[in-house]
């Protein structure tokens, strides 16, 4: 059974992931120059189901495409370069989902824009955090 300290650690990691995803979304939406419009040409794949930490596998598999899109943004709206930002997210995701579990991600039929994709994973983080508190 998870201890209170491991639950607290999971909660902090999820909060960190949530902040990173929100920062990306805010950075995109804050564009004066709507490079966002150009970013909307990129397709992202959404999880069929995202209710448990193991489902973060689906996020991990989309991090490389996410970095590619963020490179379009020329990173001036982000504190970190896209590569560093995605690397940070990847570390948190690996810790949260656990590297020893082999979970095959199932994707929904409908693809999503970067905004829809980020909002989906932000909602996921918020939902899991709420069950831990």
């Amino acid at each position: 059974a998870p201890t209170s300290s491991s639950t607290k650690k999971t909660q902090l990691q999820l909060e960190h992931l949530l902040l990173d995803l929100q920062m990306i979304l805010n950075g995109i939406n804050n564009y004066k120059n709507p490079k966002l419009t150009r970013m909307l040409t990129f397709k992202f794949y959404m999880p069929k189901k995202a209710t448990e930490l193991k489902h973060l596998q689906c996020l991990e598999e989309e991090l490389k495409p996410l970095e590619e899109v963020l490179n379009l943004a020329q990173s001036k709206n982000f504190h970190l370069r896209p590569r560093d930002l995605i690397s940070n997210i990847n570390v948190i995701v690996l810790e949260l989902k656990g590297s020893e579990t082999t979970f095959m991600c199932e994707y929904a039929d409908e693809t999503a824009t970067i905004v829809e994709f980020l909002n989906r994973w932000i909602t996921f983080c918020q939902s899991i955090i709420s069950t831990l508190t």
Partner: antibody, heavy 117, light 107 residues
Framework: EVQLVQSGTEVKKAGDSLKISCKGS????????IGWVRQMPGRGLEWMGT????????RYSPSFQGQVTMSADKSISTAYLQWGSLRASDTAMYYC??????????WGQGTMVTVSS | SYELTQPPSVSVSPGQTARITCSGD??????AYWYQQKSGQAPVLVIY???KRPSGIPERFSGSSSGTTVTLTISDVQAEDDADYYC??????????FGAGTKLTVL
């Protein structure tokens, strides 16, 4: 009503210069990219490039880079496409279009350019 | 340079279903857009982001995507659907490309 109105038909000689226009109305012209599309007689659509009127940031298709110049005057909500020296092969219909949600959702009526040699 | 491949022509009788395909290597990661162009007129957006329909476009028009191919489907084809249809997408360098177009003939 959101619309783009283009300048009229042009008949020119090879070697002439030309500047055609595209005036936007019914929306904030500054904050949408304007694309230019060529359609030669009996042919398909070709993307030439795009300009962002707020700061005149431009992106050209490799096929049209150096062949045409895109500009914009945000004070009068107008985008321009110009040639320094026309060729007979520039004979075509030229469309401007507003880029929104990553698609060209509003199109001008087109400007027909005929270049005789 | 990046290319989108469409069939040159598709013929269908009124009331039937027309399917127009568009193939491109980047389509698994890039959305596609469909435009209708009737003779002597400017193009009109009929489908954006693979499957979404702009307001004012009849429900008969739908889009789907699978791998490197996207499909525009027009069900219950009407005489007024007789037109050229172009798919459009962006390559990985963010340059925009149109397919060569498909002439839909309503018999």
């Amino acid at each position: 009503e959101v619309q783009l109105v283009q300048s009229g038909t042009e008949v020119k000689k090879a070697g002439d210069s030309l500047k055609i226009s595209c005036k936007g109305s019914g929306y904030n012209f500054d904050t949408y990219w304007i694309g230019w599309v060529r359609q030669m007689p009996g042919r398909g659509l070709e993307w030439m490039g795009t300009i962002y009127p707020a700061d005149s940031d431009t992106r050209y298709s490799p096929s049209f880079q150096g062949q045409v110049t895109m500009s914009a005057d945000k004070s009068i909500s107008t985008a321009y496409l110009q040639w320094g020296s026309l060729r007979a092969s520039d004979t075509a219909m030229y469309y401007c279009a507003r880029f929104s949600s990553s698609a060209y959702d509003i199109w001008g009526q087109g400007t027909m350019v005929t270049v005789s040699s | 340079s990046y290319e989108l491949t469409q069939p040159p022509s598709v013929s269908v009788s009124p009331g039937q279903t027309a399917r127009i395909t568009c193939s491109g290597d980047a389509l698994p990661r890039k959305f596609a857009y469909w435009y209708q162009q009737k003779s002597g007129q400017a193009p009109v957006l009929v489908i954006y982001q693979d499957t979404k329909r702009p307001s004012g476009i009849p429900e008969r028009f739908s889009g789907s995507s699978s791998g490197t191919t996207v499909t525009l489907t027009i069900s219950d084809v009407q005489a007024e659907d007789d037109a050229d249809y172009y798919c459009q997408s962006a390559d990985r360098s963010d340059s925009y490309v149109f397919g060569a177009g498909t002439k839909l003939t309503v018999l």
